[in-house]
Interface confidence: low
């Protein structure tokens, strides 16, 4: 099922973090928070559904303690006063690693999943509908927070003028040889003007179900792989692609492809055999020249989960990993709206795809 | 227009060895999973193996592992099955599909499934 | 590895019957699976992907629904050409080999 018409994405937002939930908190809404654990000394993080900015009445608190052996805590919080305790004494998180933590709202309870995993079901406490806000705190690092709504609703024309909700800025292109240390991209205001969000159905109308077996044995839904699908629109400036997934153990490359016709305008090839992340463009069936030249380490690791944030601007492509800029590729194919196709394939399981 | 293609097929004694082409067209078998699937003379389907050409990825049912091979040749956009060791029981029509996942009108439906399958070709171990 | 137990594994129906095929995975396969129908001398046909998604083509007599680890496919009226076996097949191969349903012979009551 694809989303449309959904809520912009919070785009790396500084942590402590709050944000509108516009419109609020409805059956089937699922919410995306991905980012990565810190590997400091801090021992808790925490996303919260909750009414208003205060912090006084909290809907779901979701709470993962880096404490004795580790565990989560979920909780609701009415005018100022906790409730009981539901602990589940598992933690899905580790520190200094990239997760993707997903919630569905259901009408009677949230579904967590944690790296394509259900973790936890929380049962309402308080009726759902009075969320409007989401916030995040704690000893984690944020690469984006998206929405996506399950009503299907005519897509928008491919120049609407939905805003980000907090814009994405990649850091100017290095003069000298070397480059400063990525760091999350700062505000900049170019509008989003769409999102279609492709999600993986366990039945119709919702996005998981109720498991028949425990929670933690449930499988992955993967996206069937590879995985194509149509980019609305094409590319043009301001577009924005997000990506999350898992790097199978054993994986040897994978590939993300952005095509136009029989071409692909751009090739991304992490290749674990080769240490190396190749950049290319294939015009009827010819490569041209690789661009492999990384700021950093090799940011993809076997067996761990990443997200890929590709932004088109006018002259090139800036893809992140992580929330970290990785580098820059500039256009071959020069005819924007015809990159109209992602393709994903290789040894990765995919989680999330919006476009 | 999708279509698959096999031969290969025939008669050939216990202990014997064969070779399924599967050959494609109208798409490409470098970015596709191609699947083997056998139905022995009045019975059910069986999967036997698929190759993920791309990442030269591939899996096989516990009743050919070590026996069989599958691969492509991507230059040729074909399929193949090489049948070593082949038993009695190996007597079936063996099918090649395609288990598609391309997206439909590019919102996020997909095929999970094969999709296309060719005519079958028929292998007979006998002595 | 994952098994496939569909039932009834044949049924004798009228055209303008309502039919009714289930298939119970013995795990979790989320919804993976897949409906084909063949008919004798033939290749399979897909009917239904993803559990409850119609292939293009396929008429809209057929469907197919999920309960947990229970699969349905219905046909609603039953049609001469709809007179075939019908198999089920879940495709969680990335750990798993795929595996087909024993298959269920609809057969002209």
């Known amino acids: 099922m694809a989303f449309s018409g959904s809520q912009a994405p919070y785009l790396s937002p500084a942590v402590p973090f709050s944000g509108t939930i516009q419109g609020g908190l409805q059956d089937g809404l699922q919410i995306t928070v991905n980012g990565t654990v810190l590997s400091s000394s801090g021992t808790r993080f925490a996303v919260n559904f909750q009414t208003g900015f205060s912090g006084n009445d909290i809907a779901f608190h979701f709470n993962p303690r880096f404490e004795d052996g580790g565990y989560v805590v979920c909780n609701t919080r009415q005018n100022g006063s906790w409730g009981p305790e539901e602990r589940k004494t598992h933690m899905p998180f580790q520190k200094g690693m990239p997760f993707d933590l997903c919630f569905l709202v259901q009408s009677s309870d949230f579904k967590v999943m944690v790296n394509g995993i259900l973790f936890v079901q929380y049962f309402h406490r308080v009726p759902f509908h009075r969320v409007d806000t989401i916030s995040v705190n704690g000893s984690v690092q944020l690469s984006y927070i998206s929405f996506q709504n399950p009503r299907t609703v005519p897509v928008q024309p491919a120049f609407s003028t939905v805003p980000f909700s907090q814009p994405v800025c990649f850091p100017p292109r290095p003069r000298g040889r070397r480059q400063k240390p990525p760091g999350v991209w700062p505000a900049n205001p170019a509008p989003i003007t769409q999102t279609v969000i492709h999600t993986v159905q366990s039945a119709p109308g919702q996005m998981f179900s109720t498991p028949a077996i425990p929670p933690m044995m449930y499988p992955h839904p993967a996206y069937p792989m590879p995985f194509i699908t149509t980019i609305l629109g094409g590319l043009y400036p301001s577009k924005s692609i997000l990506l999350s997934g898992t790097v199978l153990p054993s994986a040897q490359r994978f590939h993300i492809n952005l095509c136009s016709g029989n071409h692909i305008a751009f090739h991304l090839n992490p290749r674990f055999d080769e240490n190396a992340v190749v950049r290319n463009t294939q015009i009827d069936n010819s490569w041209g020249s690789e661009e492999r030249s990384l700021p950093r380490k090799m940011p993809f690791v076997r067996g761990q989960s990443f997200s890929v944030w590709i932004l088109c601007e006018a002259h090139c492509l800036k893809v992140a990993v992580d929330g970290q800029h990785l580098f820059e590729y500039y256009h071959r194919l020069r005819n924007l709206p015809t990159i109209n196709r992602l393709e994903v394939g290789g040894d990765i399981q995919l989680t999330h795809v919006q476009t | 227009e999708v279509q698959l293609v096999e031969s290969g097929g025939g008669l050939v004694q216990p202990g014997g060895s064969l070779r399924l082409s599967c050959a494609a067209s109208?798409?490409?078998?470098?970015?596709?999973?191609i699947h083997w699937v056998r139905q022995a003379p009045g019975k059910g389907l069986e999967w036997v193996a698929y190759i993920y050409p791309y990442s030269s990825s591939s899996s096989y049912a516990d009743s050919v592992k070590g026996r069989f091979t599958i691969s492509a040749d991507t230059s040729k956009n074909t399929a193949y099955l090489q049948m070593n060791s082949l038993r009695a029981e190996d007597t079936a029509v063996y099918y090649c599909?395609?288990?598609?996942?391309?997206?439909?009108?590019?919102?996020?439906?997909?095929?999970?499934?094969?999709?296309?399958w060719g005519q079958g070709t028929l292998v007979t171990v006998s002595s | 590895d994952i098994q496939m137990t569909q039932s009834p594994s044949s049924l004798s129906a009228s055209v303008g019957d309502r039919v009714t095929i289930t298939c119970r995975a013995s795990?979790?396969?989320?919804?993976?699976v897949a409906w084909y129908q063949q008919k004798p001398g033939k290749a399979p046909k897909l009917l239904i992907y993803?559990?409850?998604s119609l292939y293009s083509g396929v008429p809209s007599r057929f469907s197919g629904s999920r309960s947990g680890t229970d699969f349905t496919l219905t046909i609603s009226s039953l049609q001469p050409e709809d007179f075939a076996t019908y198999y089920c097949q879940q495709s969680y191969y990335d750990s798993n080999p795929i595996t087909f349903g024993q298959g269920t012979k609809v057969e002209i009551k």
């Open positions: 599909a395609r288990y598609s996942t391309y997206s439909w009108g590019g919102i996020g439906k997909w095929v999970w499934g094969m999709d296309y």
């Open positions: 993803s559990a409850s």
């Open positions: 795990q979790s396969v989320s919804s993976a």
């Open positions: 109208g798409f490409t078998v470098s970015s596709s999973s």
